[in-house]
């Protein structure tokens, strides 16, 4: 029986060009975590496997860093990175747990834009 729950950072926002940490945490179970997948709806970003270590998809190699822990750091964010991210925890003996994070990548703040175009 699956007793665990996944806690995520939920809905998060970050600025274009910045970085963000995607983090999930599995609690309320003694199941052993053997693999964690980080995914978008149509492609895999990264896998952390207990035996094989980290695998980062070639599409993301330049701007995805493993960790901290079982999390994933996205760097050099673009507006196209806005969307859903899923952590999939493969555990023994429970099975699979899934968490969802929605990331919104924002243009630089209005204040910054204002400062740039201020007339002296």
């Amino acid at each position: 029986m699956m007793t665990g729950t996944i806690e995520t950072t939920g809905n998060i926002s970050a600025e274009k060009g910045g970085s963000i940490i995607l983090q999930c945490h599995l609690s309320s179970t003694t199941a052993q975590v053997t693999q964690v997948n980080w995914e978008q709806q149509d492609q895999l970003l990264a896998i952390c496997n207990a035996d094989l270590g980290w695998h980062i998809s070639p599409s993301f190699k330049d701007r995805v860093a493993p960790g901290p822990g079982l999390g994933l750091t996205l760097q050099s964010l673009t507006v196209n990175d806005t969307g859903e991210y899923f952590c999939i925890y493969h555990t023994y003996p429970d099975g699979t747990y899934t968490g969802r994070i929605f990331l919104e990548v924002l243009e630089s703040s209005v204040a910054e834009h204002g400062a740039r175009f201020q007339i002296p």
Epitope: N37, Q41, D42, L44, I47, S57, S59, H90
Partner: antibody, heavy 117, light 107 residues
């Protein structure tokens, strides 16, 4: 209990359009994508595309060259697959499947589409 | 697109035999491979996902292994109900692709 129930068999003429439905029950429809898979007689499985009912986003296999359209009605928990400009090689069984992202634990029973003049 | 090359295309075996089916991906897919069993007139059934994780209710005689480009489905002791067609599928990225299938027949 998760179930995907597809509409019945269809016979169509070349050039026509077919629209197959897949009604789901037993889970929250908007939580997972619905994928469509084609299986021609005696052949293997070919992925056609998916819809994610939460936001209506879709992704298609280029093989079907714009002939396939996948939609979803969240008021009835039903996904649809429409295939246009039918030709004889589209004669196949079409399955809807629920993804755990991109692997499929739940499948519809299949819908046979026969294209014949 | 990622091609999945499955072998053999057909296989004759007896009840109690150990059987191995292989699948080779055209690029590194890490552990993102699933295996399905299909019987005539029925929908496929998920056996294994993420290369080695047995889906709920799947008998322990089915096991999957591999990572990168080379993957294996093993049935440790064939039972009468195991005679069917088996497909591998990469779930790394879209377009999702399947192997051509392995038809397992009674010798």
């Amino acid at each position: 209990e998760v179930q995907l129930k597809q509409s019945g068999a269809e016979v169509k003429k070349p050039g026509a359009t077919v629209k197959i439905s897949c009604k789901v029950s037993g889970y929250t429809f908007t939580d997972q994508a619905i994928h469509w898979v084609q299986q021609a007689p005696g052949k293997g499985l070919e992925w056609m595309g998916y819809i994610y009912p939460r936001d209506g986003s879709t992704k298609y296999n280029e093989t079907f060259k714009g002939r396939v359209t996948i939609t979803a009605d969240t008021s009835t928990d039903t996904a649809y697959m429409e295939l246009s400009s039918l030709r004889s090689e589209d004669t196949a069984v079409y399955f809807c499947a629920r993804g755990m992202l991109r692997w499929f634990a739940y499948w519809g029973q299949g819908t046979l589409v026969t294209v014949s003049s | 697109d990622i091609q999945m090359t499955q072998s053999p295309s057909s296989l004759s075996a007896s009840v109690g035999d150990r059987v191995t089916i292989t699948c080779k991906a055209s690029q590194d897919v890490s552990t993102a491979v699933a295996w399905y069993q299909q019987k005539p007139g029925k929908a496929p059934k998920l056996l294994i996902y993420s290369a080695s994780y047995r889906y709920t209710g799947v008998p322990s005689r089915f096991s999957g292994s591999g990572s990168g480009t080379d993957f294996t489905l093993t049935i440790s002791s064939l039972q009468p109900e195991d005679f069917a067609t088996y497909y591998c599928q990469q779930h790394y990225s879209t377009p999702l692709t399947f192997g051509a299938g392995t038809k397992l027949e009674l010798k």
